[in-house]
Structures are given as structure tokens and as C-alpha cells.
Interface confidence: medium
């Protein structure tokens, strides 16, 4: 027999520095957890340790914190390579300064092989990307190979950049040619590593022929057997046993996500090549674990002209931006409508000739907006001050709600109106009127929404059983502020950009902005 | 190998602007900081600002916040530096230098361009 | 923001006698074991050239005969068997916070 232990991570989305609990910034460093100096103190302790390991990211690195905005993947390939990972999978976040920004700071600089056996390039860019990104890479493990097989969301265009130039196949049909050639060149201990969500690697573990193990991402799936040393609720155990159609038991393992744990698995194979036994948790990466010294100082250097960003202008508002409470709580405020829009515009994608744009709907809870900007001081508006009105470190994400879903959550957003509760929504390519003479759970009386196939957007009425796309706040999608429709009956959910930079990336763009109230939520006659 | 090469030498009036451009090659344009550094005749270095240009992110030295604007091309691996509102003192050799990988040289600067005269 | 002095203004050295040029930061720029601080030799007409950086370590294609120390806010430059083609300005410069500055300079000339 030999085992193998592979050490995985996914999700990381620009932590790379230590974090709190919920992987916001650290603010008290005896409690804070992750980040890439801690990592590779755990890292090498298991590598001095072991005989057979391999660092594996099943993608999303990109996209998260300021380290982004500013490095936009420079620093992912600067500290990946220094904590000397094996393989990454390309993630749907990736692409997300387009193709040229995966290439240049993260493919062309990376020391370790980046894969997805499922994007096919075509056009000019196959020649410029060739040999970049590999499908499959047969890694020398002590005295044995283990094949990596890549794999990513076929959802990437509709949640990122990649452009027009390349392909995103299925998943499975296109995973299986490639596990064949790995077979013929007598590899028989392969590893399906990729980012499309916990429900496709179980399917990838059930049916693709030749894969021992599946190491995943996108869905930051917390799978842990025994007690969890966090408040992460485990959605099953670890290693998660799949059984393949043609008989075999398939592990599927993710590790979470924001770097907060470092994903375990030991791994035995016979002679054969069969998976004799897998066992295995996420290590929670928290202050008992020092950060390496020297992978911290690196990190010290990085930041310091990350501290300067915060302070520079990004665009003027001409307008008061009211995030007072006193408005964004009870009516339409205009700082809502802004961030609405920015998150709309973030998430244009013409991917069909039928749509103007795959998504037009955005709600976003009113308590999730923490402070006003005052136009007085020249208009100028900073990643600083965004962060006052943002402060959390969430991300806008896109999801999948039936119609009914929605007037649900509506419904919920005024339940208790007029006590400055959290949950009053805020809106975007949504017109609502609500009645608040009528008992709660029945005081929407008109809900239009913009229409996304056709070719001039105007607002039609809510169907009740109509599956509609909307950007909201990661913290709705996951039930929060009472919002628990959307978290039961959610049919799809994507992880997006981070609130800030969704923010400030369009006051960047448009740079003078005068965002107004207009009329998108209102009370009808006599009740307000 | 790295080259930085920059544009030629210029004589302004002065509250006239200058822009010196600055033409980056034989690295990742995209992944390191170029700084801009001038040297008055017969004094020593004074460091003017930097800029990322894979994210256009710039920093100032306060001394010349108002005045200098500093950019880069990505497409044609260029940085720029403009100064405005020149006057007498600003008569120059402005200097653009790439910044060390932070795995080494940690914000040294490792190469340089050749300088170029700016005289007001 | 840091001030970096340095000391002396002048040196003059007979070839193959030891250079030892001092740069004092008015602040630490020293943190996690490493210190920001970085040397330059500039000869007239050119661009500086990078000898030191992170106080000790030499640049690839730089002579041995330059070596740097120090820690905190005291560092040295030294020029071992000082030949004739040393006859430059040598600056030093820190990186430890924004702004980055330089030192005025130390002019060494060979007798």
C-alpha cells in the first residue's frame, strides 16, 4: 500500500492576511485565524512529517479584499509559489479582470501547474494561451505519480469575464477523455481538482471512470467528521464517500473557504491504483498555529503600499449619499439605489442575443448600509469611506428565487416596518409598492420587475412561479437579517465580487456620479 | 533582459507641464512597481511618487502630490510622469526605475532607466 | 516621514584601503528581522545602480568587495580593496514606509 496526503485549500478569495472568525478583518490578533503565513507553517510541519504530499487550490484565489484591488494577482502568484503549491484549478473568479488578467500576473508567473480539462480556448487567444493552463499534470510523488485533473464552473461566463474566446464545456464530458489518456500512460492514482460546487464533484466522483479523488471549490462546502472546531455547520462528513457507478467509493473533499482551514485528507491505494482507505478533517487554522516568520515579513512588505490605497479619491459624488438609517430603513435612499446599480453594472454579461443581460434585479437589506457620504468635502469619494459604508466584508452574489420567493422576502422586508429594523430592502431594476395599512405578510400590492429577454428593459408584473436571477449581499443568500426564504428555496447560488470593490470599481468607472431617489419603492396613499 | 527607457531630454517654460514617458521591457510589465526619482544638478535623489500598473494604483510624496500625475499604458508597457505647474527648482534629471520583486529586492530598485534632463 | 543622514559628506581612500560609509535613519526601518534599507553607487553622467538591498544582501553582478549591515536605525556600507572604478556617490535609501527616501550622499574619491 501507499498512502498519500493531500493538502488542500479553495475559495481563498485574497486572504492573505490572518483574519477574525468570520474572515473580516482581524481586529484582535490572539483570535484570529488563516492567512498564508500560518498556512505554511502548517504546510511544512506536515511536509516534514509525512512522505507523500501535495498542496492543491481548487481555485478562487482571486477577487475578495484590497490585496486584490491593488495587486490584481501578482500577490497570488507571489505567495502561492512561495508556499510552493503543487496544482491550482482555475476558478470562476479568475477571470474576472478578463482573460489578460489571469494571464499576465497569475498564468505567466505561477511556478506550479494551473488547470481545467473543461475551457477550451479558441480564436487568436488559443495560440497566446497554449500551454499556459493544462487539462491534466502527472505530478512525481516520492516513487510514484498522481495525475491532477482541473475542472471549473461552465457558469464562469455568466459570473465572470472570460471573454468570447473561450469555451466552457461540461464538466464531465469533458473531465472523461482526459482521465483515458492518464490511464494510457499508466497513471493510476488520479485526483479530479476543481471549482463548480459540491453537488458537481459528487457527480464528477459518480460519474467519471478513472477518478480516485475529488478535491472541490465554489460552494466554500464545510464537510467535517466528528465535533467542528468552529462555527462552521458541517454539510456532511470528511472525507464525503461518494459510490461510483461503476462500483468504486470516491472521496470528495473542500475545505470551506477564506483560507480559515487547511483541507486533510490521507489517501491509500494498493498496487493497483484503488483507493484502500481515506480518512481525514479541515485543520482550523486559528492562533495555535504561529505564522511563519518569514512568509509574515513578506506580507509586511506587501502592505505597505496597500495602506496608501484607502486614502485615494476613486470618483466625485456631486449628490449627498444618504446611508443614514433614518432613510435606508424605512424608504428608498439613494445610497441604496447607487449600490444597486453598481451591483448590476458589475454583473453585465451580453451572453445571449435574446438578453440585453442575463440579470436585472438587485435587493440589498437597508441594516447592511452603515454610513452616509457627505458630497461636502470636494466630492471625494475613498475606499475608506466606502468601507465605513460597507464595512462587513461581504460579497454580492447572484442567485436563482422563484417569483413566489420573492414577494416572500418582500413581504418579510416590512413585516415590522417602522421599528429601524435591518431587513427593509433596499432595490435595483425592482419597482414595489407596499401598503401599510394591511397586515404584515400581505402588504406588497404591486411588485414589478425589469425584464432581461428584451430588447428595450421596462417593468413587468412578478410572476409567482417564473426562476429569476438577482445580485443581493452574501449575508441574505445565507438567511440573514430573517431573510430564511431565500436561504430554504434559493434554486442556484454564486459567490460574487466583494461589496467594496464592486463599489468603488463603478465610481471609478462613471466618476462623477449623482445617484437620486426615483421612485423605485413607495407606499401607497394613506398608509405612510 | 529588463530595460527601461525613457524619453528625451525637454526645456519648458515655466507653469508649463512636461510629461517624461518611460518604456518598460523584458519583464512582467503588469507585476512591479515603477518608481520616478529626479536629481536637482550637483544634489542627491528624491523619491516622487510610484505607480502599479497592473492596477494603476499610484502613491505621491506629499512634496509633490499637487502637482504630479503618474500612469501607465499597459498595452505599450509605458509609465508616464507629468508635472505641472513647472517652475525653476524643478530643473532635473527625472529618473524611472523598476522595483524589485518583493520575493528579493523588497521595494529596492533594481533597474533604472537612462534619466532624462528636464529644464525650466 | 523618515530622514535618512548619512556620514561622512566626503571620503578620499588610496586604493585597496577599506571604505565605510555610515547611513542613519531618523526611525526604525527594521521589522521581522528584516531592514528596509537599501545602498546605491552612482557615477557621474549614469543612472544609480543597485549594490545592497535589505541591508546585507548583495545584488547579482555586484562585486564581494561591497557588503552591508546594520539593524534599526544604524547602517553601514563597506567597500573592501577600494579600486579606482569605486569612485562614485553612494546613496542609501529605505523602503520601510511611504515615502521611501534617500540619504544626501556620500561622495567617495580615490587618491
Known amino acids: 500500500a501507499w498512502e498519500l496526503t493531500i493538502l488542500h485549500t479553495n475559495d481563498v478569495h485574497s486572504r492573505l492576511e490572518q483574519t477574525s472568525e468570520d474572515s473580516s478583518k482581524c481586529v484582535n490578533a490572539s483570535r484570529c485565524m488563516g492567512g498564508v503565513a500560518r498556512l505554511f507553517t502548517k504546510v511544512q510541519q506536515i511536509r516534514r512529517a509525512e512522505p507523500n504530499v501535495l498542496l492543491l487550490d481548487a481555485g478562487d484565489q482571486y477577487q475578495g479584499t484590497i490585496w486584490f484591488t491593488v495587486y490584481k494577482g501578482a500577490e497570488v502568484a507571489h505567495f502561492m509559489n512561495a508556499l510552493r503549491y503543487d496544482a491550482m484549478a482555475l476558478g470562476n473568479h479568475e477571470f474576472d479582470n478578463g482573460v489578460e488578467g489571469l494571464i499576465e500576473p497569475l498564468l505567466k508567473e505561477a511556478k506550479f501547474p494551473i488547470l481545467s480539462a473543461n475551457i477550451k480556448a479558441k480564436g487568436p487567444l488559443a495560440s497566446q494561451i497554449s500551454g499556459l493552463y493544462l487539462p491534466y499534470k502527472v505530478l512525481p510523488v516520492g516513487d510514484e505519480v498522481v495525475g491532477i485533473v482541473g475542472y471549473t464552473s461552465k457558469e464562469t461566463p455568466f459570473l465572470s469575464n472570460p471573454g468570447t474566446n473561450l469555451v466552457f464545456e461540461d464538466e464531465i464530458t469533458a473531465l472523461q477523455p482526459e482521465v483515458d489518456k492518464l490511464k494510457t500512460l499508466n497513471v493510476n492514482k488520479i485526483i479530479a481538482l476543481g471549482h463548480s460546487g459540491f453537488e458537481m464533484d459528487k457527480l464528477i466522483a459518480q460519474k467519471v471512470r478513472g477518478v480516485d479523488v475529488v478535491v472541490g471549490g465554489h460552494s466554500n462546502t464545510f464537510l467535517y467528521t466528528g465535533n467542528p472546531p468552529s462555527k462552521e455547520v458541517p454539510a456532511g462528513k470528511y472525507p464525503f464517500i461518494v459510490t461510483s457507478d461503476d462500483g468504486r467509493k470516491v472521496p470528495v473533499v473542500q475545505a470551506y473557504a477564506f483560507g480559515k482551514y487547511l483541507g486533510y485528507l490521507k489517501i491509500e491505494f494498493d498496487e493497483r491504483g484503488n483507493v484502500i482507505s481515506s480518512h481525514g478533517n479541515p485543520i482550523l487554522l486559528n492562533s495555535s498555529i504561529p505564522e511563519d516568520p518569514s512568509i509574515k515579513a513578506d506580507i509586511n512588505k506587501w502592505r505597505i503600499k496597500l495602506d496608501n490605497y484607502s486614502t485615494q479619491e476613486l470618483g466625485k459624488t456631486i449628490v449627498y449619499l444618504d446611508g443614514s438609517s433614518q432613510s435606508c430603513r424605512f424608504r428608498e435612499c439613494n445610497m441604496g439605489n447607487l449600490i444597486c446599480d453598481a451591483m448590476i453594472n458589475n454583473n453585465l454579461r451580453h451572453t445571449d442575443e435574446m438578453f440585453w443581460n442575463h440579470v436585472s434585479m438587485c435587493i440589498l437589506n437597508g441594516g447592511g448600509i452603515r454610513s452616509p457620504i457627505d458630497e461636502r468635502n470636494n466630492g471625494t469619494i475613498t475606499w475608506e469611506n466606502l468601507a465605513a459604508v460597507l464595512p462587513f466584508g461581504g460579497t454580492f452574489d447572484l442567485v436563482q428565487l422563484k417569483g413566489s420567493t420573492l414577494k416572500k422576502a418582500f413581504e418579510h422586508s416590512v413585516h415590522r416596518y417602522g421599528q429601524s429594523t435591518g431587513e427593509f430592502l433596499q432595490v435595483g431594476g425592482i419597482h414595489v409598492v407596499y401598503d401599510l395599512s394591511r397586515k404584515p405578510g400581505d402588504r406588497v400590492v404591486k411588485l414589478d420587475v425589469l425584464c432581461t429577454k428584451c430588447r428595450v428593459p421596462s417593468y413587468d408584473p412578478l410572476k409567482m412561479d417564473e426562476v429569476y436571477k438577482v445580485i443581493l449581499p452574501n449575508f441574505l443568500a445565507n438567511g440573514g437579517d430573517g431573510f430564511q426564504m431565500i436561504k430554504d428555496e434559493l434554486l442556484r447560488h454564486d459567490s460574487g465580487d466583494q461589496d467594496i470593490n464592486v463599489v468603488s470599481t463603478y465610481i471609478s468607472k462613471m466618476k462623477v456620479i449623482y445617484p437620486a431617489v426615483e421612485g423605485r419603492i413607495k407606499f401607497s396613499t394613506g398608509s405612510h | 533582459q529588463v530595460q527601461l527607457v525613457q524619453s528625451g531630454a525637454e526645456v519648458e517654460k515655466p507653469g508649463a507641464s512636461v510629461k517624461v514617458s518611460c518604456k518598460a521591457s523584458g519583464y512582467t510589465f503588469t507585476s512591479y512597481w515603477i518608481t520616478w526619482v529626479r536629481q536637482a544638478p550637483g544634489q542627491g535623489l528624491e523619491w516622487m511618487g510610484d505607480?502599479?500598473?497592473?492596477?494603476?494604483?499610484?502613491n505621491y510624496n506629499e512634496k509633490f502630490k499637487t502637482r504630479v500625475t503618474i500612469t501607465a499604458d499597459k498595452s505599450t508597457s509605458t509609465a508616464y510622469m507629468e508635472l505641472s505647474s513647472l517652475r525653476s527648482e524643478d530643473t532635473a534629471v527625472y529618473y524611472c526605475a523598476k522595483e524589485g520583486g518583493l520575493t528579493t529586492e523588497d521595494y529596492a530598485l533594481d533597474y533604472w532607466g537612462q534619466g532624462t534632463l528636464v529644464t525650466v | 516621514e523618515i530622514v535618512l543622514t548619512q556620514s561622512p559628506a566626503t571620503l578620499s581612500l588610496s586604493p585597496g584601503e577599506r571604505a565605510t560609509l555610515s547611513c542613519r535613519a531618523s526611525k526604525d526601518v527594521s521589522t521581522s528581522g528584516y531592514s528596509y534599507m537599501h545602498w546605491y553607487q552612482q557615477k557621474p553622467g549614469q543612472a544609480p545602480r543597485l549594490l545592497i538591498y535589505l541591508a546585507s544582501n548583495l545584488e547579482s553582478g555586484i562585486p564581494p568587495r561591497f557588503s552591508g549591515s546594520g539593524y534599526g536605525t544604524d547602517f553601514t556600507l563597506t567597500i573592501n580593496n577600494i579600486e579606482s572604478e569605486d569612485a562614485a556617490y553612494y546613496f542609501c535609501q529605505h523602503s520601510r514606509e511611504l515615502p521611501f527616501t534617500f540619504g544626501q550622499g556620500t561622495k567617495v574619491e580615490i587618491k
Open positions: 505607480i502599479y500598473p497592473g492596477s494603476g494604483n499610484t
